[in-house]
Amino acid sequence: APVPPGEDSKDVAAPHRQPLTSSERIDKQIRYILDGISALRKETCNKSNMCESSKEALAENNLNLPKMAEKDGCFQSGFNEETCLVKIITGLLEFEVYLEYLQNRFESSEEQARAVQMSTKVLIQFLQKKAKNLDAITTPDPTTNASLLTKLQAQNQWLQDMTTHLILRSFKEFLQSSLRALRQM
């Protein structure tokens, strides 16, 4: 399911509940994705010892994964709502190719991997409605993404396991940073 339970307008389980605001919906959506990532990480960690690897070792697998930095305006110091929102949306769009890579990488959590991917697409739509400056958001080039995907899928098994772990870890961190920032908006 791309949205958390109870988010659908047809949900009649709690007819007297106030409809969620845009911010509440975004917050709930991120936490829903984070729960999905948590489940995927459990499978990855049970399958290999990648989770014990330090960030320094992982960094050698030079993936260009989106990461928050001071200049992005999402931290407490130098917080800038508009700059930060652009960074969050841009980062999520950049993560999409990596989430595509994660499909078929899981045995018992295949549906969970699909749910994380679809939920992220919904989250991007929610955030784009919130953003005023959509022109500042750069969309990744589909051709570049296609060749990156081919390259990642051609790696040996060990590197694929490492890549999977690193994507999940980085995506989790990016969403946590985003959630902290969005709660200030």
């Epitope: 917050d27 984070l34 729960d35 948590s38 330090s54 990461k67 931290f75 990016f174 969403l175 902290r180």
Partner: antibody, heavy 118, light 110 residues
Framework: SVEESGGRLVTPGTPLTLTCTVS????????MSWVRQAPGKGLEWIGY??????TWYANWAKGRFTISKTSSTTVDLKMTSLTTEDTATYFC???????????????WGPGTLVTVSS | NIVMTQTPSPVSGAVGGTVTINCQAS??????LSWYQQKPGQPPRLLIY???TLTSGVSSRFKGSGAGTQFTLTISGVECADAATYYC????????????FGGGTKVVVV
């Protein structure tokens, strides 16, 4: 394990740096927090340093307290313009990551006492 | 600015009885609330997180409930060892906050 060090008796206005040393923990994977407790009082949160390297502080701590990861096993708390009100036991605590978003503190050090007195 | 308010303090409970501690957030914090136990001369110890999930190794006599702004810690079958100060902590927002902890509730066992 988590252990704090650097607490001592200082005079008002003196800067002081406390160090939190962890063992068996990869600091790059965990959020860390500093919390203090004045004698006979409750817990008072100072700030967090998250895995994304961002630092978030309590309103009263901004500008006077600085948290930084100084190595893969140490986190510092730099304090300036200390007053007698800063007399407290300072705790360092590790955040948990088995759930995806949650700032619960599941491992605490024994604390280090800072006394500010003239 | 989220403020955490704990009541009552102190609270007394008889051995074998039940003690209830309340924690109120000034605005919704979803289920991002933890409970800690602290005994004199010791650091706090995490009991419950996500409002109701018991930390590994903690007795099932401790039960957390609530969501949004109202939370409760219930200790059933109170033992002498439960005499301590209990703190709630919000994990929802770390900006524009004076303290993520509640003021604490001292439990006296009689």
């Amino acid at each position: 394990s988590v252990e704090e060090s650097g607490g001592r008796l200082v005079t008002p206005g003196t800067p002081l740096t406390l160090t939190c040393t962890v063992s068996g923990i990869d600091l790059s994977s965990y959020d860390m927090s500093w919390v203090r407790q004045a004698p006979g009082k409750g817990l008072e949160w100072i700030g967090y340093i998250y895995t994304d390297s961002s630092t978030w502080y309590a309103n009263w701590a901004k500008g006077r307290f600085t948290i930084s990861k100084t190595s893969s096993t140490t986190v510092d708390l730099k304090m300036t313009s200390l007053t007698t009100e800063d007399t407290a036991t300072y705790f360092c605590a590790k955040g948990s990551t088995d759930y995806a978003f949650d700032t619960r503190l599941d491992l605490w050090g024994p604390g280090t006492l800072v006394t500010v007195s003239s | 600015n989220i403020v955490m308010t704990q009541t009552p303090s102190p609270v007394s409970g008889a051995v074998g009885g039940t003690v209830t501690i309340n924690c109120q957030a000034s605005q919704s914090i979803s289920n991002e609330l933890s409970w800690y136990q602290q005994k004199p001369g010791q650091p706090p110890r995490l009991l419950i997180y996500r409002a109701s999930t018991l930390t590994s190794g903690v007795s099932s006599r401790f039960k957390g409930s609530g969501a949004g702004t109202q939370f409760t810690l219930t200790i059933s079958g109170v033992e002498c060892a439960d005499a301590a100060t209990y703190y709630c902590q919000q994990g929802y927002n770390s900006n524009d906050v004076d303290n993520v902890f509640g003021g604490g509730t001292k439990v006296v066992v009689v």
